[in-house]
Interface confidence: low
């Protein structure tokens, strides 16, 4: 509600109302709890008197605020309590349906899940939401039909469509298709991108770096993201969780921010880390209504109400004008169970007993002035950045604790606020943004840009210099060209244009006319002033020694043709001749070409062989085969010149190896042995006691070493053992006891040994037998 002339004396807005100008007039804009031209009356609609969804309206009844109800369809009466005859009175909606009147005679039922129809009488086949994955359910003949979205099929849309089975494939340029429930996903090759790999991948276009990260290509398909503070990940997609190790106290919940965190405090705590108790009285100036005095408590507040008000927030009026004592000419207005003192200008308080301190505008401009209804003093509500009783003191935000400026920015206090003076390389209201100096591509000529704090550094390609690599290094600056050569500056090099007569990278060489090697055929060049002379090697002549002297004129070759060379000639001799000048006739017999004793006769570039009998061929190399008739019976035929020779097998003899040799002819068997002839051998049958091939040796019985401790002597059909001392028996295997004969005298003790004995003598005796 608005009332006119609220800025005039005596027309001030009460109970926290604000005076606002609109359409050329001034009026009080009241808070919800008060109404009236000057917000002087409690709002009668606050107690929601209109029932059955009736709407409450504030009305003016002879200057006093009252209410009137606008009833919903189907109800009437001052409080909308009287039902009118209407279509819903018969409860037409079944199965728990809610009846909504359209007109007094028409209704619409809001049916619970599982029911449909005009009166919710029909069971709804779609009530159980049988169609999955966003399928649309349509009732059909006591059942239902599901209309599935494109990615699903089947009676209840539960079967996934395999989009990867389509031909041609959805993923282009060699991308791999991965089927997913209700969808598909293309995994592209490094060279392409897009949902279907349809776009060529260009690093940083568009930039994949999120959250303000700066993208920089590192290759044809690779990039890197330089993230802003507070972000990380390959593409700066991850907000670094600043909550670990947070300082939120008293049950405060940490809420991660960008490169910072905040504490969400429970209602009774406040401050950056929930360490300050909430002063509800300061937080809510109207916590205690109707002039009640607010007392802050730990985790809450109490209201001490002024006389005539009660309740937790002093909102219940318990007084009236009958017992009222309105001061200083105030007018008392009667209320239901209350009274209201209408104060003259300059007075305030429930009974108009206080001077209104806000009249003198004690609060600094931009702040709100409220009068304390208890003591009439001004309560100034300060805007952000100001403090003090009159909001005239500037809050120094730079001294509150932690520097509000990030990255060592300098905090400068201003009236009602602060400013951050950032270090080079940072920007933003709180210096929170790292400036990427490489974004503007400051490095020229293919240089590499390194972003640094507050600056950048260009790594120049060879041949460039300067902060931006913009300067083509002047390699001519040091005047490198000698002998007045002209220097041409190039990229990362220089070139000298030399005057006539000089050459070289720096024109440092006097031109040597011999450098072009004008003298041919190995001639020596003598350089002269702007000329040269050729000293020819042997065999050449002419200015440049280009003419080969013909050594074949006159012809030096006797029996052959001449070939000219360099300072020489070569004679190609006719067959049968040799020598430097083909002057010597070759003796073809010198190599003794006639074999098997043939005689050689030299001819012109030829020879003739006269062969011995039994040989033939140009060189008498063919020996006629005299073995062709196989003349050797038991032997091998060896062909000879004009004959043969038989090499007999063992046991045969004769020129044709046809005679078996009798090996018994010489009586080889001795000591009465009998000889039996064989091929290439004989066998002796020896009498007893003899052996070996010719019965010369008798059997040596000593070969088996029968004598154990003695020497063996062989005899005819036997052997004899000569025993070692101390041993006896046929085979010398019996150890004799030499002590049996008592050899030790003079009381000596005898000890038998393997070979002999030992005497241990009594005192005074010695010797082998103690004798």
């Amino acid at each position: 509600a608005r009332g006119p002339r609220c800025s005039q004396p005596g027309e001030t807005c009460l109970n926290g109302g604000k005076c606002e100008a609109a359409n050329g007039t001034e009026a009080c804009v009241c808070g919800g709890a008060f109404v009236g031209p000057r917000c002087q009356d409690p709002n009668p609609c606050l107690s929601t008197p209109c029932k059955n969804a009736g709407t409450c309206h504030v009305v003016d009844r002879r200057g006093v605020a009252d209410y009137a109800c606008s009833c919903a369809l189907g109800f009437s009466g001052p409080l909308c309590l009287t039902p009118l005859d209407n279509a819903c009175l018969t409860n037409p909606c079944r199965n728990g349906g809610t009846c909504d009147l359209l007109t007094l005679t028409e209704y619409k039922c809001r049916c619970p899940p599982g029911w449909s129809g005009k009166s919710c009488q029909q069971a709804d086949p779609c009530a159980s939401n049988p169609c999955a994955n966003g399928g649309q359910c349509l009732p059909f003949e006591a059942s239902y039909i599901c209309h599935c979205p494109p990615s699903f099929h089947g009676p209840t849309c539960r079967q996934d469509v395999n989009e990867c089975g389509q031909k041609p494939g959805l993923c282009r340029h060699g991308g791999t298709c991965h089927n997913e429930v209700g969808s598909y996903r293309c995994v592209c090759r490094a060279t392409h991108t897009g949902p279907n790999c349809e776009r060529p991948y260009v690093p940083c276009s568009p930039s994949p770096c999120q959250n303000g990260g700066t993208c920089r290509p590192t290759g044809d398909v690779t990039h890197e993201c330089a993230c802003l503070p507070g972000f990380t990940g390959q593409n700066c997609e991850e907000n670094i969780d600043d909550c670990p190790g947070n300082n939120c106290k008293n049950g405060g919940a940490c809420v991660d921010g960008v490169n910072t965190y905040n504490c969400r405090c429970p209602p009774e705590w406040t401050g950056q880390y929930c360490t300050e108790d909430v002063d509800e009285c300061q937080l809510m100036p109207n916590a205690c209504q109707n002039g009640g005095t607010c007392h802050n408590t730990h985790g809450g507040y109490n209201c001490v109400c002024v006389n005539g008000w009660t309740g937790e927030d002093c909102s219940e009026n318990i007084d009236d004008c009958a017992s009222a004592a309105c001061f200083h000419g105030a007018t008392c207005h009667d209320r239901v169970a209350s009274f209201y003192c209408e104060c003259p200008h300059g007075r305030t308080g429930l009974l108009c007993h206080l001077n209104d301190a806000c009249i003198s505008n004690p609060c600094n401009e931009g702040s709100n002035c409220d009068t304390n209804p208890v003591n009439g003093k001004a309560i100034c509500t300060c805007p952000s950045g100001y403090t003090g009783p009159a909001c005239s003191q500037d809050v120094d935000e730079c001294s509150l604790g932690a520097n509000p400026c990030e990255h060592a920015g300098k905090c400068i206090n201003t009236l009602g606020s602060f400013e951050c003076q950032c270090l080079q390389g940072y920007t933003g209201p709180r210096c929170e943004i790292d400036v990427n100096e490489c974004v503007s591509n400051p490095c020229q000529n293919d240089a590499t840009c390194l972003d640094q704090i507050g600056e950048f550094q260009c790594i120049c390609m060879p041949g460039y210099e300067g902060v931006h690599c913009e300067v083509n290094t002047d390699e001519c600056a040091s005047s490198p060209c000698l002998h007045n050569g002209r220097c041409l500056d190039k990229i990362n090099e220089f070139q000298c244009e030399c005057p006539t007569g000089f050459t070289g990278h720096l024109c440092q060489y006097d031109v040597d006319e011999c450098a072009s090697t004008p003298c041919k055929n190995g001639a020596k060049c003598l350089d002269g002033p702007n000329t040269y002379t050729c000293v020819c090697t042997e065999g050449y002549t002419g200015t440049h020694c280009e003419v080969d002297i013909d050594e074949c004129d006159p012809d030096p070759c006797h029996y052959g043709s001449c070939k000219d060379g360099v300072a020489t000639f070569t004679c190609l001799c006719r067959p049968g001749y040799t020598g430097h000048h083909c002057e010597t006739n070759i003796n073809e017999c010198s190599s003794q070409p006639c074999r098997h004793g043939g005689t050689c006769q030299d001819r012109d570039n030829a020879y003739l062989c006269f062969c011995l009998k039994g040989t033939t061929g140009p060189n008498c190399e063919i020996n006629l085969d005299d073995c062709a008739s196989s003349p050797c019976d038991s032997g091998t035929c060896l062909d000879k010149i004009d004959g043969y020779e038989c090499a007999c097998e063992p046991g045969y003899t004769g020129s044709m190896c046809n005679i078996n040799i009798d090996e018994c002819a010489g009586n080889p068997c001795h000591n009465g042995g009998t000889c039996e002839d064989g091929i290439n051998g004989f066998t002796c049958r020896c009498p007893e006691g003899y052996h070996d091939p010719t019965c010369l040796s008798e059997v040596n019985e000593c070969n088996s070493n029968p004598c154990v401790h003695g020497a063996c002597r062989d005899s005819l059909n036997g052997y004899k053992c000569d025993c070692d001392p101390g041993w006896s028996g046929t085979n010398c295997d019996i150890n004799n006891n030499e002590c049996e004969s008592n050899p030790c005298v003079n009381g000596g003790t005898c000890k038998d040994m393997t070979s002999g004995y030992v005497c241990t003598c009594r005192e005074g005796f010695s010797g082998p037998n103690c004798q």
Partner: antibody
Framework: EVQLVESGPGLVKPSETLSLTCTVS????????WSWIRQTPGKGLEWIGY???????NSNPSLKSRVTMSVDTSKNQVSLTLSSVTAADTAIYYC?????????WGRGTMVTVSS | QSVLTQPPSVSGAPRQRVTISCSGS????????VNWYQQLPGEAPKLLIY???LLPSGVSDRFSGSKSGTSASLAISGLQSGDEADYYC???????????FGGGTKLTVL
Amino acid sequence: EVQLVESGPGLVKPSETLSLTCTVSGGSMTSNFWSWIRQTPGKGLEWIGYVLYTGSTNSNPSLKSRVTMSVDTSKNQVSLTLSSVTAADTAIYYCARGNGWYLPWGRGTMVTVSS
Amino acid sequence: QSVLTQPPSVSGAPRQRVTISCSGSSSNIENNIVNWYQQLPGEAPKLLIYYDNLLPSGVSDRFSGSKSGTSASLAISGLQSGDEADYYCAAWDDSLKAVVFGGGTKLTVL
């Protein structure tokens, strides 16, 4: 995925020239730096230099007078020559993509300088 | 003597956290980006951290990098036996006009 393979003689005589080739497969050579790094027991990892796909080069000032690098994009090859070698040049020589950070690296090739 | 200084060796028990420091100067670490490499026995070095603190794809987020002034550090949490390797830091040096490496740190998992 880009792969790099270094090749060259394993033994070089003092005062001779060392020549190595790095063959690039699985990716394009353009828009990239191709670097050489060596590892010796005495000096650890040592940056030799890089050649850009355009042929521009930059090398370690301590080796500059002896180093030549080139690129042949048609053969997908990068080459390194180091002249007048001594025993101090005995090392594992690596080829790598990048300039500043290197990803990936080749397996490396061991070069011994000895007579 | 390397331009960037690293401790020759560090060790830690499985599941522990270790850090490897890399000390330089204003001509390298302070004014240039720092990169870290891991070299498993018998293998070539592999990029582990680049641009001071960024992870290449495929590298576990147990590895993290940080930089302050003329020093950088590599942190490895939840140590595993497979982390046993040599670790090298690297940066561009404005004075030497070259990429410089640390001497390497051998990590042993006890």
